[in-house]
């Protein structure tokens, strides 16, 4: 009887162990699925980062070029204003000379 | 004897089941660690994306402002060149008038 009781207990323990095994398998399946999703998400995000970095680099480069162009145009405006000023002075001077003569 | 053999087999099967459970548990722990790592990586990457997008938006906005400034300066240069041209013509005309008189 002791033997059959022990055997019965053993069988019950074995069935319980199998159930634990099956629970772990299902949990592992879910975790692996989540891992795959997270990895896919991380990979996709990394690609987005690369794309954004490239775009940002282009924009930084564009901003620098534009800044240089602005500087160049501002210098041009200053130079032209100077020339205009000179011409106006010359014109005024020549007008004065004309009147005096 | 048959009973003891069955019991012995049962004990062996139970030990094997426990061993399998340990293997699964270890694999589950490793997979959960990998999942945590992948999720952390994905979250960190998502923050990087947000930062990069903000930087890119600022640069795009800056580029548009600079573009507008360039346009404004180019118009200014055109206008000044026109004024210079007019002044030169006036000057030349006035010089001709002076010479003729």
């Amino acid at each position: 009887t002791a033997n059959s009781v022990a055997c019965r207990d053993g069988l019950r323990a074995q069935a319980e162990c199998r159930n634990t095994t099956h629970l772990l398998q299902r949990q592992l399946t879910r975790t692996q699925d989540s891992l795959l999703q997270a990895e896919t998400q991380a990979n996709s995000c990394n690609l987005t980062v690369v794309t954004l970095q490239e775009s940002l680099e282009k924009k930084v480069s564009q901003a620098l070029e534009q800044q240089a162009r602005i500087k160049e145009l501002e210098n041009e405006v200053t130079k032209l204003n100077q020339e205009l000023e000179n011409l106006r002075i010359q014109k005024e001077t020549s007008s004065t000379v004309q009147v005096n003569s | 004897t048959a009973n003891s053999v069955a019991c012995r087999d049962g004990l062996r099967a139970q030990a094997e089941c426990r061993n399998t459970t340990h293997l699964l548990q270890r694999q589950l722990t490793r997979t959960q660690d990998s999942l945590l790592q992948a999720e952390t990586q994905a979250n960190s990457c998502n923050l990087t994306v947000v930062t990069l997008q903000e930087s890119l938006e600022k640069k795009v906005s800056q580029a548009l402002e600079q573009q507008a400034r360039i346009k404004e300066l180019e118009n200014e240069v055109t206008k000044l060149n026109q004024e210079l041209e007019n002044l030169r013509i006036q000057k030349e005309t006035s010089s001709t008038v002076q010479v003729n008189s």
Partner: antibody, heavy 116, light 108 residues
Framework: AQSLEESGGRLVKPDETLTLTCTVS????????IYWVRQAPGKGLEYIGF?????DTYYATWAKGRFTISRPSTTVDLKITSPTTGDTATYFC?????WGYGLDLWGPGTLVTISS | ELDLTQTPSSTSTAVGGTVTINCQAS??????LSWYQQKPGQPPKLLIY???KLASGVPSRFKGSGSGTQFTLTISGVQREDVATYYC??????????FGGGTEVVVK
């Protein structure tokens, strides 16, 4: 003695629904996984899916939606929806204690022929 | 998706010879691999489980080894009754489970 036996295999027309049954003897279905595997004539073995003792079912990606595994009582059924000639095969059910134990007990198989 | 590549597809040996069958998994499957023997007109029979454990009643000339992605079934001292097709079955998880393509063993 523990055993499994498949039944329900026959000649059916394409798109006709077919249900195969795996009858178990001496096996407590609540603590085993029952797998369905098929083998086309002259080809290799192909995993379809399985049912846990808890009743949870899992399928191979290609089999999802086309096959349904259920456990109405002391039998395990495999329903084949809208079969095509490519589903012609011998269908086996097999028992497993878990991933680490393999499929330790198999039924003799039942032949399904899909033809118009 | 789990893919199991079994090599060779066919092999021939003399009685008493040794046969080695390889099974390569497309991703790491730990030790969740089993080997089966199938004779014509019969269902498959489990030989090895958990990559290296011998199933009940299987002769000791059958030996399984490997883990992760590389697995091997070795039959030492091949007998005439070993003429059959051998399959590996790998489990990555409940969804990704697959059989290898099979290896036919012929005895000269």
């Amino acid at each position: 003695a523990q055993s499994l036996e498949e039944s329900g295999g026959r000649l059916v027309k394409p798109d006709e629904t077919l249900t195969l049954t795996c009858t178990v003897s001496g096996i407590d279905l609540s603590s085993y996984m029952i797998y369905w595997v098929r083998q086309a004539p002259g080809k290799g073995l192909e995993y379809i899916g399985f049912i846990y003792g808890s009743g949870d079912t899992y399928y191979a990606t290609w089999a999802k939606g086309r096959f349904t595994i259920s456990r109405p009582s002391t039998t395990v059924d495999l329903k084949i929806t809208s079969p095509t000639t490519g589903d012609t095969a011998t269908y086996f059910c097999a028992r497993s204690s878990g991933w680490g134990y393999g499929l330790d007990l198999w039924g003799p198989g039942t032949l399904v022929t899909i033809s118009s | 998706e789990l893919d199991l590549t079994q090599t060779p597809s066919s092999t021939s040996t003399a009685v008493g010879g040794t046969v080695t069958i390889n099974c390569q998994a497309s991703q790491s499957i730990n030790v969740w691999l089993s080997w089966y023997q199938q004779k014509p007109g019969q269902p498959p029979k489990l030989l090895i489980y958990q990559a290296s454990k011998l199933a009940s009643g299987v002769p000791s000339r059958f030996k399984g080894s490997g883990s992760g992605t590389q697995f091997t079934l070795t039959i030492s001292g091949v007998q005439r009754e070993d003429v059959a097709t051998y399959y590996c079955l790998g489990i990555y998880n409940d969804i990704d489970t697959a059989f290898g393509g099979g290896t036919e063993v012929v005895v000269k």
